[in-house]
Interface confidence: medium
């Protein structure tokens, strides 16, 4: 009679994470008597997956039990596969004894697990940056297998080319991670812009995963200031306005100084939003010129988003009769607190 052979017909099996893997094994004889065991890996560190004779293996189901004692099909199904289950599985016949001894092993079946990448997470710089600066964005995705993966960067639908990508680990692993860093040059129009990281993998069936970052969380557009003066109908009164334009984010504090002394401080509240996402705001002072003997230096000082203050000054000549000095470029919003200086 021919000696028993252990046949594992499949050299490799590929299964998506979460599914069941069927590992086939048949023996060609009922002799010698003894149990079958399944192991992952070979050598002394091999891991017992299923022991026909004893043990409790909640994820393992025997595929065939139809003839029980005469059974020669020892295929198993392993449920709820994860990337950690990847490896080579051996069906091993033991000869009955005290203890049972290994008789013959199958050639092994390599189980590879197709793991979906996690949703890409895009993160930007910790601090805001101003236009014309280059900022870095990172994109991370984990848990995918096999190793082959494609990552692309986009800004407002336009593909970026300045990025570096690494897939770890370099060697064989049950699952992999990807890490990519893209460099983006900010412009004043980027408040509404988006940076997108797109990951394509065999497990996604042509439907890539995307992670996004809004540049509104990264950009700071500093304001431009303009101080102007217009006469008002009342004699000896002048209206001085400070137009704060094209700033982002909204967090802004304005202080009026009269000859270097603080006159009023206010916080931008009712602002006007521009199409590009930046804001405009205007504050004014109603100045009673007759209360002053000398010229008055009025300064509009703006602290934007915690940055060092910027200012614009305007010299108010009190010796001359009030007349138009500069033009009023009307902002959409003229609401602010009036303040008379006496």
């Amino acid at each position: 009679e021919e000696e028993l052979q252990v046949i594992q017909p499949d050299k490799s099996v590929s299964v998506a994470a979460g599914e069941s893997a069927i590992l086939h094994c048949t023996v060609t004889s009922l002799i010698p008597v003894g149990p079958i065991q399944w192991f992952r890996g070979a050598g002394p560190a091999r891991e017992l997956i299923y022991n026909q004779k004893e043990g409790h293996f909640p994820r393992v189901t025997t595929v065939s039990e139809s003839t029980k004692r005469e059974n020669m099909d020892f295929s198993i199904s392993i449920s709820n596969i994860t990337p950690a289950d990847a490896g080579t599985y051996y069906c091993v016949k033991f000869r009955k004894g005290s203890p049972d001894t290994e008789f013959k092993s199958g050639a092994g079946t390599e189980l590879s697990v197709r793991g979906k990448p996690s949703a890409p997470v895009v993160s930007g710089p910790a601090a805001r940056a101003t236009p014309q600066h280059t900022v870095s964005f990172t994109c991370e995705s984990h848990g995918f297998s096999p190793r082959d993966i494609t990552l692309k960067w986009f800004k407002n639908g336009n593909e970026l080319s300045d990025f570096q990508t690494n897939v770890d680990p370099v060697g064989e692993s049950v699952s992999y991670s990807i890490h990519s860093t893209a460099k983006v040059v900010l412009t004043r129009e980027d408040v509404h812009s988006q940076v997108i990281c797109e990951v394509a993998h065999v497990t996604l069936q042509g439907d890539p995963l995307r992670g996004t970052a809004n540049l509104s969380e990264t950009i700071r557009v500093p304001p431009t200031l303009e101080v102007t003066q217009q006469p008002v109908r009342a004699e000896n009164q002048v209206n001085v306005t400070c137009q704060v334009r094209k700033f982002y984010p909204q967090r802004l504090q304005l202080t009026w100084l009269e000859n270097g002394n603080v006159s009023r401080t206010e916080t931008a509240s009712t602002v006007t939003e521009n199409k590009d996402g930046t804001y405009n705001w205007m504050s004014w002072l109603l100045v009673n010129v007759s209360a002053h003997r000398d010229d008055v230096k009025l300064t509009c000082q703006v602290e934007h988003d915690g940055q060092p203050a910027v200012s614009k000054s305007h010299d108010l000549k009190v010796s001359a009769h009030p007349k138009e000095q500069g033009s009023n470029t009307a902002a959409e919003n003229t609401g602010s607190n009036e303040r008379n200086i006496y």
């Epitope: 004779k53 004893e54 043990g55 029980k68």
Partner: antibody, heavy 120, light 107 residues
């Protein structure tokens, strides 16, 4: 042919101990997992404990955990159930049964049973 | 624990007629469901193992089906010697629970 013969049953007072024995013959005892199952008078079957062929894997029902101990002696082809701190609700016919190979297999041969009565 | 619920609790069937017993599991036991027959004053006897496999020596009028949580034992043509209590039992995971039993009688 396969035979399983239980012994050691009897009347015992609550809180006392009893040791049941199951003598196996007609098969290679060391190849099989063994089980104790009990049946209270007029009631259904209740699994009590299991022991694998090499005694590596032992399981108990919650109702007996900490009080009962299952063991085996493969050299003597015997299965044991040491029952301590017995209660009235332990009154039942106790069957030993064998299980062919792995834990997912059925109990294919049963003994005739031995009666345990716990009463004061 | 996996709770097994048999229905009906008792069943009266005419000789030669079909008898069907159901066993529902509170969670999946895959195919690890077995059926036993216990006649009065006797020990249980294995009829069907792993949901649908007929134990050696058991008449072919007995059959089993199902997987997961719903299982059925069928006696295609009831004989007088089939009067007994029938139990389902799962071996998917300890504790290895039994159903409460179904008593089959002749109508």
């Amino acid at each position: 042919q396969v035979q399983l013969v239980e012994s050691g049953g009897g009347v015992v007072q609550p809180g006392r101990s009893l040791r049941l024995s199951c003598a196996a013959s007609g098969f290679t005892f060391s190849d099989y997992g063994m089980i104790w199952v009990r049946q209270a008078p007029g009631k259904g079957l209740e699994w009590v404990a299991s022991i694998s062929s090499s005694s590596s894997y032992i399981y108990y029902a919650d109702s007996v955990k900490g009080r009962f101990t299952i063991s085996r002696d493969n050299s003597k082809n015997r299965l044991y159930l040491q029952m301590n701190s017995l209660r009235a609700e332990d009154t039942a016919v106790y069957y030993c049964a064998r299980r062919y190979y792995g834990f997912n297999y059925p109990f294919d041969y049963w003994g005739q049973g031995t009666m345990v009565t716990v009463s004061s | 624990d996996t709770v097994l619920t048999q229905s009906p609790d008792s069943l009266a069937v005419s000789l030669g007629q079909r008898a069907t017993i159901n066993c529902g599991a509170s969670k999946s036991v895959r195919t690890y469901m077995h059926w036993y027959q216990q006649k009065p004053g006797q020990q249980p006897k294995l009829l069907i193992y792993s949901a649908s496999n007929l134990e050696a020596g058991v008449p072919s009028r007995f059959s089993g089906s199902g997987s997961g949580t719903d299982f059925t034992l069928t006696i295609s043509s009831l004989q007088a010697e089939d009067v007994a209590v029938y139990y389902c039992q799962q071996s998917n995971e300890p504790p290895y629970t039994f159903g409460q039993g179904t008593k089959v009688e002749i109508k």
